[in-house]
Interface confidence: low
Amino acid sequence: HGTELPSPPSVWFEAEFFHHILHWTPIPNQSESTCYEVALLRYGIESWNSISNCSQTLSYDLTAVTLDLYHSNGYRARVRAVDGSRHSNWTVTNTRFSVDEVTLTVGSVNLEIHNGFILGKIQLPRPKMAPANDTYESIFSHFREYEIAIRKVPGNFTFTHKKVKHENFSLLTSGEVGEFCVQVKPSVASRSNKGMWSKEECISLTRQYFTVTN
């Protein structure tokens, strides 16, 4: 049977909160019958578990088998090419997949206008796969922070950045009118996780939203 097939050049995780996807690059000159076998190792249980015998895609959703990621020492994954009776050597992820590798996201951002202020509320992610007790705020229970980027339309497209330590934030518009667009990027001050910018949410501010106080 040999190992004439080349190995997948690289294997890596791309993960968000309870959305843990393993990716790999295809072998060169793969045929229509080439598929990929995926195995998973949990740190502390030093044996590989076969997860998929023959995936023809270049990614595999491992969320269901890594639900304890946030309470474990992490995982390694490996992938090899299979074509009929031939198979390649394994390619192993070159870093441990742990909570540190999870890219932080927000669920959504809601904006309201109150008397010249924009009040924002950050909704935390609520993935369907997450066990009931594993909420974003229970796993990242301290030092949650959010970078806020504000863009004024019309305008010269310059962004105002500020950092807040709360899922609610207040932006004073200084009496300006127009469309204000807001993006949010989460982080946790005590951790090194990357954060992803949310999609832009916009709200229009017109004169009717201002009340004059003496």
């Epitope: 008397n115 010249g116 202020f117 500020k162 950092k163 807040v164 330590k165 709360h166 609610n168 934030f169 207040s170 004073l172 200084s174 009496g175 201002f210 009340t211 004059v212 106080t213 003496n214």
Partner: nanobody, 125 residues
């Protein structure tokens, strides 16, 4: 000296009115935001109203909208809270607060740096 001094609290029947005053030192009156918070026994301190002193823009918590008005008198370096149609659930110690600049949520007590000693408001039904 950095200080905030509240006055105007007292006892009133439900449906009545009170006006609270908060006199600030010059340094504090030049802050960006001043606010009234309240705290009743066994509960967390909650924001009632916030004013942005540079423009007079105001924010109110839902439970007091239409009943309470926050305002300022720049000459007297004073912020007021006019409380009308008072209810028994408005009974609390009322505190004046100020912060020079904040990137945090304005209805969060932790966002504010400077606090007065408080004035008691009791509404009886």
């Amino acid at each position: 000296q950095v200080q905030l001094q509240e006055s105007g609290g007292g006892s009133v029947q439900a449906g009545g009115s009170l006006r609270l005053s908060c006199v600030a030192s010059r340094y504090l009156y030049s802050t960006n935001y001043m606010a009234w918070f309240r705290q009743s026994p066994g509960k967390e301190r909650e924001a009632v109203a916030v004013i942005y002193t540079a423009s007079g823009a105001t924010l109110y918590t839902d439970s007091v909208k239409g009943r309470f008005t926050i305002s300022q008198d720049n000459a007297k370096m004073t912020v007021y809270l006019q409380m009308n149609r008072l209810k028994s659930e408005d009974t609390a110690m009322y505190y004046c607060a100020a912060v020079r600049k904040t990137d945090s949520y304005l209805f969060d007590a932790q966002s504010f740096t400077y606090w007065g000693q408080g004035t008691q408001v009791t509404v009886s039904s």
